[in-house]
């Protein structure tokens, strides 16, 4: 986990301090999951709970680079579309998945089209 401080953020939790500098989210165990983020403002320090998503840290960080196919068609049933990524390059010690599947919600336009298609098929 990077030790670099994030950009300064205004108004830390429950304080009159004007500008808090927040460090990275450091998981309590392993390298993802629930952890803490430390903030400093002058002589004050704060710790807030945070979470590093495990799939993001391992598979979508700079450690793993993927080559992605085009997005698949919208699935009217789930309202999502999928695309697959194939590992292009991994940092030497990064245990990246060979392939990953990414889903995202369809745009309202695509959703409507998929629903219309489904409806036509049933007739």
């Amino acid at each position: 986990v990077a030790k670099k401080k994030d950009k300064v953020k205004k108004g830390g939790p429950g304080s009159e301090c004007a500008e808090w500098a927040w460090g990275p989210c450091t998981p309590s165990s392993k390298d993802c999951g629930v952890g803490f983020r430390e903030g400093t403002c002058g002589a004050q320090t704060q710790r807030i709970r945070c979470r590093v998503p495990c799939n993001w840290k391992k598979e979508f960080g700079a450690d793993c680079k993927y080559k992605f196919e085009n997005w698949g068609a919208c699935d009217g049933g789930t309202g999502t579309k999928v695309r697959q990524g194939t590992l292009k390059k991994a940092r030497y010690n990064a245990q990246c998945q060979e392939t990953i599947r990414v889903t995202k919600p369809c745009t309202p336009k695509t959703k409507a089209k998929a629903k219309a298609k489904k409806g036509k098929g049933k007739d």
């Epitope: 390059k89 030497y92 998945q97 060979e98």
Partner: antibody
């Protein structure tokens, strides 16, 4: 599974050069780091450097910066090790190996380079 | 460069015995330590990687421990085919370095 077949070894005169090849077949060659390691007769293993076929990023052991050049030809799924200014102490078996931190590595069979007049 | 010191240099044991091989790093290398087996005339074969992770196809009698500076490869019950040279290698920083090896021989 990745299979690596090496070629290009042999007898070289001191001061000469040699290009070793490491041809890959099987799983995607371009996704994994390719290491080059050598082993002098009766000695241990010594890392020369590595190259990533996707963008040719190269990390070289500084000991070999004036002696070794790593390249790849993605169209041929082949990695190359060019060795220059060879001396008797460069006599060794040279290995290539394809590394993935997810599944481990695969090694070529090795190729013997003998530097002698 | 990170120096890996393996001990003992030679280990004489009988089939069925337990073997404990040590690898010490000159500085902390987290869990970026891998174990290889090499037989005469063959390329090295990866047995354990990242200190304790097992490799597909490697018998369960091989296990490793770490992380930090002191690492151990344990072979729970030696088979005749286990007699070979064992190397540790670190991938924590460049250049990658290998230990000098431990020769496991039949007593």
């Amino acid at each position: 599974q990745v299979q690596l077949v090496q070629s290009g070894g042999g007898l070289v005169q001191p001061g000469g050069s040699l290009r070793l090849s490491c041809a890959a077949s099987g799983q995607s060659f371009s996704s994994y780091w390719m290491n080059w390691v050598r082993q002098a007769p009766g000695q241990g293993l010594e890392w020369i450097g590595m190259i990533h076929p996707s963008d040719s990023e190269t990390i070289l052991n500084q000991k070999f910066k004036d002696k070794a050049t790593l390249t790849v030809d993605i169209s041929k799924n082949t990695a190359y090790l060019q060795m220059n200014s060879l001396r008797a102490e460069d006599t060794a078996v040279y290995y290539c190996s394809s590394w993935s931190a997810k599944r481990g590595d695969f090694w070529g069979q090795g190729t013997l380079v003998t530097v002698s007049s | 460069d990170i120096v890996l010191t393996q001990s003992p240099a030679t280990l004489s044991l009988s089939p069925g015995e337990r073997a404990t091989l040590s690898c010490r790093a000159s500085e902390s290398i987290s869990n970026n330590l891998h174990w290889y087996q090499q037989k005469p005339g063959q390329a090295p074969r990866l047995l354990i990687y990242y200190a304790s992770q097992s490799i597909s196809g490697i018998p369960a009698r091989f296990s490793g421990s770490g992380p930090g500076t002191d690492f151990t490869l344990t072979i729970s019950s030696l088979e005749p085919e286990d007699f070979a040279v064992y190397y540790c290698q670190q991938s924590n920083s460049w250049p990658l370095t290998f230990g000098g090896g431990t020769k496991l021989e039949i007593k």
